[in-house]
């Protein structure tokens, strides 16, 4: 289960949001929810343009 990069962190460093891969962090509800509830970008066919580049950390953001 991917929970984001792990590293040694300073005491004041931000912690990653621990959402499982099928979930995204709801910034307003302040907890993880199904990504489909948040209008996160749908996967597109290869070659299709997307509205904004998405990183591998998508569910955590």
């Amino acid at each position: 289960m991917r929970r984001g990069p792990r590293s040694l962190r300073g005491r004041d460093a931000p912690a990653p949001t621990p959402c499982v891969p099928a979930e995204c962090f709801d910034l307003l509800a302040r907890h993880c929810v199904a990504c489909g509830l948040l209008r996160t970008p749908r996967p597109k066919p290869a070659g299709a343009s997307s509205p904004a580049p998405r990183t591998a950390l998508q569910p955590q953001e």
Partner: antibody
């Protein structure tokens, strides 16, 4: 493509209720956060509130208890009501959808100018 | 609420010039998840606002590379390297870190000198 369109009266009398509809096509309002934002003459943008995928709402405290946002999922529309309007509520009203990954307003209606005047 | 202070309010430029708009927030916009949710919008005359830059420095799809965003914490800048006629309008910064409510800068009107 997701498209939003505001509709409602362009002229409202002081003390009356401003009522606007936002019609959404290309996406379901049972997903995401759906918002009302207004722009005053002179360019100030004010965030008014949202209705969420679950139907929960948030209202900007600056609007006190004058505001209500509701929805009709069968029509894929959400609504703004602003009670007891004054001339200070004259503005262009926008509905907008929120990107749920980077949290910007990714889709906006064209806006509707509402003038409060007797 | 987070106050977003934008300067200048009006920015007269000549076509081809560089333009720079500043946005300062009343608190750090670094979220506890490490992201900085500072965005820039452009509202052209007669249109609704459109996203230009998201998360400080990422250009939205279709936005020309003459637009760039930078900054961190509480101080952010939008630069247009060579202003074109189609760039005229009102630019707004906005924060989505400490929400709700979402808050906007007061707007900078880019106009021809």
């Amino acid at each position: 493509d997701v498209q939003l369109q505001e509709s409602g009266p362009s002229l409202v009398k002081p003390s009356q209720t401003l009522s606007l509809t936002c019609s959404v096509t290309g996406d379901s309002i049972t997903s995401g956060y759906w918002n009302w934002i207004r722009k005053f003459p002179g360019n100030k943008l004010e965030y008014m509130g949202y209705i969420s995928y679950s139907g929960s709402t948030y209202y900007n405290p600056s609007l006190k208890s004058r505001i209500s946002i509701t929805r009709d999922t069968s029509k894929n529309q959400f609504y703004l009501q602003l009670l007891s309007v004054t001339t200070e509520d004259t503005a262009t009203y926008y509905c907008a959808g929120l990107d749920g990954l980077y949290w910007y307003f990714d889709v906006w209606g064209a806006g509707t100018l509402v003038t409060v005047s007797s | 609420d987070i106050v977003m202070t934008q300067t200048p309010l009006s920015l007269p430029v000549s076509l081809g010039d560089q333009a720079s708009i500043s946005c300062r927030s009343s608190q750090s916009l670094v979220h506890s998840n490490g992201n900085t949710y500072l965005h820039w919008y452009l509202q052209k005359p007669g249109q609704s606002p459109k996203l230009l830059i998201y998360k400080v420095s990422n250009r939205f799809s279709g936005v020309p590379d003459r637009f760039s965003g930078s900054g961190s914490g509480t101080d952010f800048t939008l630069k247009i390297s060579r202003v074109e006629a189609e760039d005229l309008g009102v630019y707004f910064c906005s924060q989505s870190t400490h929400v709700p409510p979402f808050t906007f800068g007061s707007g900078t009107k880019l106009e021809i000198k």
